[in-house]
């Protein structure tokens, strides 16, 4: 049936779209870059992506309509919504601040939550992290006791145990949790890079033509025999 | 042989300054980092500054007893470290001694040490 | 800063005497742990390194071990020459910290 079917009798797709033959009598267009439409009839009006905030664009008849996320208006939703025109959103007193697409409550002392709707009590739940335990001071204060390594009055910062390493022979140090570690260069191992690395070990023909490798701090050396010399006794 | 020889110690008034020098031989100075440590008579050792290692950048570390008053530094080619003591007090009199720290995390070199009097 | 806590502060021993000194960290130091030998009007002398490594030229009679805390010298057999004042150092991170010593006296 493919030379009578539409996509060859009437060639409905425009604008340089590819027919697709779907079944006997049906059929669908792909469009060119810039082309939407059953038949790539209308320009793709979103291809300029008018739509702001993090909107759907879809384009209907060579315009494009915006499908705006909650907190945003106006016809490519770049306006935000002041919800803190709208009263009632804060309980108990609670201040309203208005943010791009959406509002936050500045709660009165004693509440909490979204809406400052719920009772606060400083230690439920516990607002200090990386395991630090929270300690009740007053009706509305706490305190959180830190575990090693950590700091900052919720225990978010990990102290940075960098600026008194000890890495010798060249290593380089890395920050961990209350501790270092430290990067060695090749020659050397160990937690702080104390260790030497055997190279003769590690290069079983790190010298040739009979050469002996005797190992050294931070590196090694070759005894050579038979006339031969170099670091390798390869000359 | 490795070898460190402090000098510059002496009698100083609270308030005043000296400059103590350690010239070190024997060994590649820039390789290692470098310590200053001190003691009062009759007491215990107190680590004082350090300089870490060229690989390190010479970068400095000062204990907090003497932290904005002392400057630790070095002259690699005189082989030379060098405490600059500004400020002094009389808690700051003891022998100082220089020590080389011999990448083992231990201060495997010591100078002869010498004497610093911070009195009026 | 991290503390050390070194004990006894003095020991009377005789020659032949097995003498052990103690040092603790208030953290973990992976080993780090020094110590030294001072005489009178002398200076430090590096023994152990790496709480068990002896130092070139020292008696094999001192031995250190420990991990973590928890360190220990040992003089398996004492001798007139070692007569002094034992200190421990970490030197995990600065500020490098010293125990108080311990005098080791003839009895």
């Known amino acids: 049936y493919s030379t009578s079917h539409p996509c060859f009798v009437s060639r409905p797709c425009l604008n340089g779209g590819t027919c697709h033959m779907l079944s006997r009598d049906t059929y669908e267009c792909t469009c060119q870059v810039g082309f939407t439409g059953k038949e790539c009839q209308w320009t793709d009006a979103c291809l300029s992506h008018p739509c702001a905030n993090g909107s759907t664009c879809t384009t209907v008849a060579n315009q494009f309509s915006c499908k705006c996320l909650t907190g945003f208006t106006g016809q490519k939703c770049e306006t935000d919504v002041n919800e803190c025109d709208i009263p009632g959103h804060c309980q108990h007193g609670g201040t309203c601040l208005n943010l791009p697409g959406s509002y936050q409550c500045q709660c009165p002392q004693g509440f909490t939550g979204q809406y400052c709707d719920s009772l606060y009590v400083p230690c439920a739940p516990s607002p200090c992290v990386n395991g630090g335990t929270c300690r009740q001071t007053g009706d509305f204060t706490f305190e959180c006791n830190c575990l090693p390594g950590f700091e900052g009055s919720t225990c978010e910062r990990n102290i940075d145990d960098c600026p008194n390493h000890r890495c010798q022979n060249g290593g380089v140090c890395v920050d961990g949790v209350n501790t270092y570690n430290c990067r060695c260069p090749p020659q050397w191992t160990g937690q702080f890079c104390t260790e030497d690395v055997d190279e003769c070990l590690l290069q079983p023909n790190a010298c040739q033509n009979g050469g002996t490798c005797a190992n050294r701090n931070g590196g090694y050396g070759c005894v050579c025999v038979n006339g031969w010399s170099g670091d390798d006794c390869s000359e | 042989e490795v070898q460190l020889v402090e000098s510059g110690g002496g009698l100083v008034q609270p308030g005043g300054s000296l400059k103590l020098s350690c010239a070190v031989s024997g060994f590649t100075f820039s390789d290692f980092y470098m310590e200053w440590v001190r003691q009062a008579s009759g007491k215990g050792l107190e680590w004082v500054a350090a300089q870490r290692n060229k690989a390190n950048d010479f970068s400095i570390v000062y204990s907090a007893s003497v932290k904005d008053r002392f400057t630790i530094s070095r002259d690699d080619s005189k082989s030379t470290l060098y405490l600059q003591m500004n400020s002094l007090k009389t808690e700051d009199t003891a022998v100082y001694y220089c020590?080389?720290?011999?990448?083992?995390?231990?201060?495997?070199?010591w100078g002869q040490g010498t004497l610093v009097t911070v009195s009026s | 800063d991290i503390q050390m806590t070194q004990s006894p502060s003095s020991v009377s021993a005789s020659v032949g005497d097995r003498v052990t000194i103690t040092c603790q960290t208030s953290?973990?130091?992976?080993?780090?742990l020094a110590w030294y030998q001072q005489k009178p009007g002398k200076s430090p002398k590096l023994l152990i390194y790496g709480a068990s490594r002896l130092q070139d030229g020292v008696p094999s009679r001192f031995s250190g071990s420990g991990s973590g805390t928890d360190y220990t010298l040992t003089i398996s057999s004492l001798q007139p020459e070692d007569f002094a004042t034992y200190y421990c150092?970490?030197?995990?991170?600065?500020?490098?910290?010293f125990g108080g010593g311990t005098k080791v006296e003839i009895k």
């Open positions: 020590s080389r720290d011999g990448g083992k995390l231990a201060l495997d070199a």
């Open positions: 150092q970490q030197g995990f991170k600065y500020p490098l910290t």
């Open positions: 953290e973990d130091i992976y080993s780090g």
